[in-house]
Interface confidence: low
């Protein structure tokens, strides 16, 4: 179980790196973040480490109310603060693993 979670963590972070460059990857991560109401791997600050095309931005899918451009100069109160690895991991442990 721990190995699966570690792999999932690494994979999620790797996909984050590809987010600005790969639309298919972006769609998958956007869906995960929106569905699980989470942002980033550990938390939303993970997006600061991604050399994406814009500064001070998280994906719009991190927003509590998703609208185009809502991730710009985001207000911390308006985005999901919980990380996706922990949140999705909890769901996996409960329902799959």
């Amino acid at each position: 179980r721990d190995k699966v979670m570690s792999e999932f963590n690494n994979n999620f972070r790797q996909q984050m790196e590809n987010y600005p460059k790969n639309n298919h990857t972006a769609s998958i991560l956007d869906r995960m973040q929106a569905d699980f109401k989470c942002c980033g791997a550990a938390n939303y600050t993970d997006w600061e480490k991604i050399p994406s095309m814009s500064k001070n931005r998280v994906p719009d899918s991190c927003c509590i109310n998703v609208t185009v451009g809502c991730g710009i100069n985001f207000n911390e109160k308006a985005i999901h603060k919980e990380g996706c690895v922990e949140k999705i991991g909890g769901w996996l442990r409960k329902n799959v693993l």
């Epitope: 600005p20 460059k21 639309n23 050399p51 994406s52 095309m53 814009s54 500064k55 001070n56 931005r57 185009v68 451009g69 991730g71 710009i72 100069n73």
Partner: antibody, heavy 120, light 108 residues
Framework: EVQLVESGGALVQPGRSLRLSCAAS????????MHWVRQAPGKGLEWVSG????????GYADSVKGRFTISRDNAKKSLYLQMNSLRAEDTALYYC?????????????WGQGTLVTVSS | DIQMTQSPSSLSASVGDRVTITCRAS??????LNWYQQKPGKAPKLLIY???SLQSGVPSRFSGSGSGTDFTLTISSLQPEDFATYYC??????????FGQGTRLEIK
């Protein structure tokens, strides 16, 4: 007031190189993605290349991939386009453009362009 | 790459007319569609981004709508300064950024 001023355009022979520059002012240059877009005489707009605020990501049109290199110097508030192995089909007016903060691919300000003519 | 197709390629209209230009994407681009205006000898100017958001300083007679693959730019009452070429551009799947071929709006 946002200003983008391109320079470096010239008449060059096929196979030669050229370096275009874009001097920016009126905004915090290192917060924004920047682009090069070209327009052949009497034709439409063609995106050439884009670069992120921190040079972490760069993109190129297939037509220039491997021949053109985009770069920026945030300290000098300048954008560059190194053009190698130039072809006749690269003849165009080259515009420098600034991306929106929250959507790097949307160009909200453009320079007046610099003309590149590739001919023998 | 996503292809953008504009129609018509050119159109003639009179001052005061309501004009609609359409843009179709080869696949769904959500609302990531932008419109630019270009006058002869001038650089393009951003009019609308994210399908319907009016860029600051652009007159309210310009409006955009649509999502998915079909989009429209509408000028509610044509003014003399609106005669120009209009381009749509997708910013969904990039790079590359792709533009439509342009629509030339002429005086009737």
């Amino acid at each position: 007031e946002v200003q983008l001023v391109e320079s470096g355009g010239a008449l060059v022979q096929p196979g030669r190189s050229l370096r275009l520059s874009c001097a920016a002012s009126g905004f915090t240059f290192d917060d924004y993605a920047m682009h090069w877009v070209r327009q052949a005489p009497g034709k439409g707009l063609e995106w050439v290349s884009g670069i992120s605020w921190n040079s972490g990501t760069m993109g190129y049109a297939d037509s220039v991939k491997g021949r053109f290199t985009i770069s920026r110097d945030n300290a000098k508030k300048s954008l560059y386009l190194q053009m190698n192995s130039l072809r006749a089909e690269d003849t165009a007016l080259y515009y420098c453009g600034k991306g929106l903060l929250h959507q790097w691919e949307v160009l909200d300000y453009w320079g007046q362009g610099t003309l590149v003519t590739v001919s023998s | 790459d996503i292809q953008m197709t504009q129609s018509p390629s050119s159109l003639s209209a009179s001052v005061g007319d309501r004009v609609t230009i359409t843009c179709r994407a080869s696949q769904s681009i959500s609302s990531y569609l932008n419109w630019y205006q270009q006058k002869p000898g001038k650089a393009p100017k951003l009019l609308i981004y994210a399908a319907s958001s009016l860029q600051s300083g652009v007159p309210s007679r310009f409006s955009g709508s649509g999502s998915g693959t079909d989009f429209t730019l509408t000028i509610s009452s044509l003014q003399p300064e609106d005669f120009a070429t209009y381009y749509c551009q997708q910013s969904y799947s990039t790079p590359p950024i792709t533009f439509g071929q342009g629509t030339r709006l002429e005086i009737k």
